[in-house]
Amino acid sequence: LQDPCSNCPAGTFCDNNRNQICSPCPPNSFSSAGGQRTCDICRQCKGVFRTRKECSSTSNAECDCTPGFHCLGAGCSMCEQDCKQGQELTKKGCKDCCFGTFNDQKRGICRPWTNCSLDGKSVLVNGTKERDVVCGPSPADLSPGASSVTPPAPAREPGHSPQ
């Protein structure tokens, strides 16, 4: 015997209190698939969250973060404070990267500079809190008689990560 609730389309729910008729989801609730016995409450984008996509009877609202914050977690479940380049977020707030580390984004942690010598290369441009070092040719390439080396292009300004 077919379940009468299977006929209830997205945007409705099978109302057991009313002889299993397909009742429309009440305002501020939704059902994204057919055959649902309840409608889910719409997500509310409040505080540091802002609405990226409004809720409808068939789909939940989607949130992102207000300026100065960025999304973390599946479906932007959290908003984390942005820091400046050259900083990382700690429990006490934004802190400058320690010497020998850098962060070229507004989020994430400070990472150690590249160790050029591990690749047998020399440091062409020193690192900063905001930029990694630029490794140059190996010392052997700089010996007399070696072909001239075109200096590398300046480090590219990083784009913002997708929010």
Epitope: P9, T12, C22, S23, P24, P27, S57, T58
Partner: antibody
């Protein structure tokens, strides 16, 4: 422009049939927008006839008194809803309104047509 | 569901506070809409979900109530407010969307 336009009203004899149309423009019926029919006899109250699910399913919600005489249907390709009225009586004389019942407005009728007059008389 | 409105008519003056009530025959939570209708015109949505003002509706209109008892209030009646007001259950289902029979607001005197 977002609007509903009814057509098909007119004079019909008792026992006759009539099909009213309601064409939507500027938006599409969907799971968020249900087309409905409401009527108003001269000098009388508004009377709810029924609504139909706005998406691709044919679920209808009807007033009990309409059973067997009035049927609501929809053609999504034309973005049009219909009211088929059979076995018409003098007391069915009324202005028939098409309305949009919107999830965003608590399923209230947030958009109405201008109405079409149906007169049942011999 | 039956909707009972009262009074069926009332007379008032510009500036008056006007209150119209609507009673549902069974609980409809907050699923109630209020409309204004002028002669020869289609109804206009004023309030939905019992208390939410529809877009473009002046703030002198307000709605309250839940369950079976609801109220529409016009805080200071304006000349353009003389009309008939209807409540409607939006508790979908067969016979779930009934209207009240209206309250006609006319000019006193």
């Amino acid at each position: 422009e977002v609007q509903l336009v009814e057509s098909g009203g007119g004079l019909v004899q008792p026992g006759g049939s009539l099909r009213l149309s309601c064409a939507a423009s500027g938006f599409s019926f969907s799971a968020n927008y249900y087309p409905c029919w409401v009527r108003q006899a001269p000098g009388k109250c508004l009377e709810w006839i029924g609504c139909i699910y706005g998406g691709s399913s044919d679920i209808t919600y009807d007033a009990q008194w309409t059973k067997g005489r009035f049927t609501i249907s929809r053609d999504n390709s034309k973005n049009t809803v219909y009211l088929q009225m059979n076995s018409l009586r003098a007391e069915d004389t009324a202005v028939y309104y098409c309305a949009r019942s919107a999830w965003y407005s608590g399923w209230g009728g947030d958009l109405w047509g201008q109405g079409t007059l149906v007169t049942v008389s011999s | 569901i039956q909707m009972t409105q009262s009074p069926s008519s009332l007379s008032a003056s510009v500036g008056d506070r006007v209150t119209i009530t609507c009673q549902a025959s069974q609980s409809i939570s907050n699923r109630l809409a209020w409309y204004q209708q002028k002669p020869g015109k289609a109804p206009k949505l004023l309030i939905y979900s019992a208390s939410t003002l529809a877009s473009g509706v002046p703030s002198r209109f307000s709605g309250s109530g839940s369950g079976t008892d609801f109220t529409l209030t016009i805080s200071s009646l304006q000349p353009e407010d003389f009309a008939t007001y209807y409540c409607q259950s939006t508790y979908y289902g067969n016979d779930g969307n009934a209207f009240g029979c209206g309250t006609k607001v006319t000019v006193l005197g």
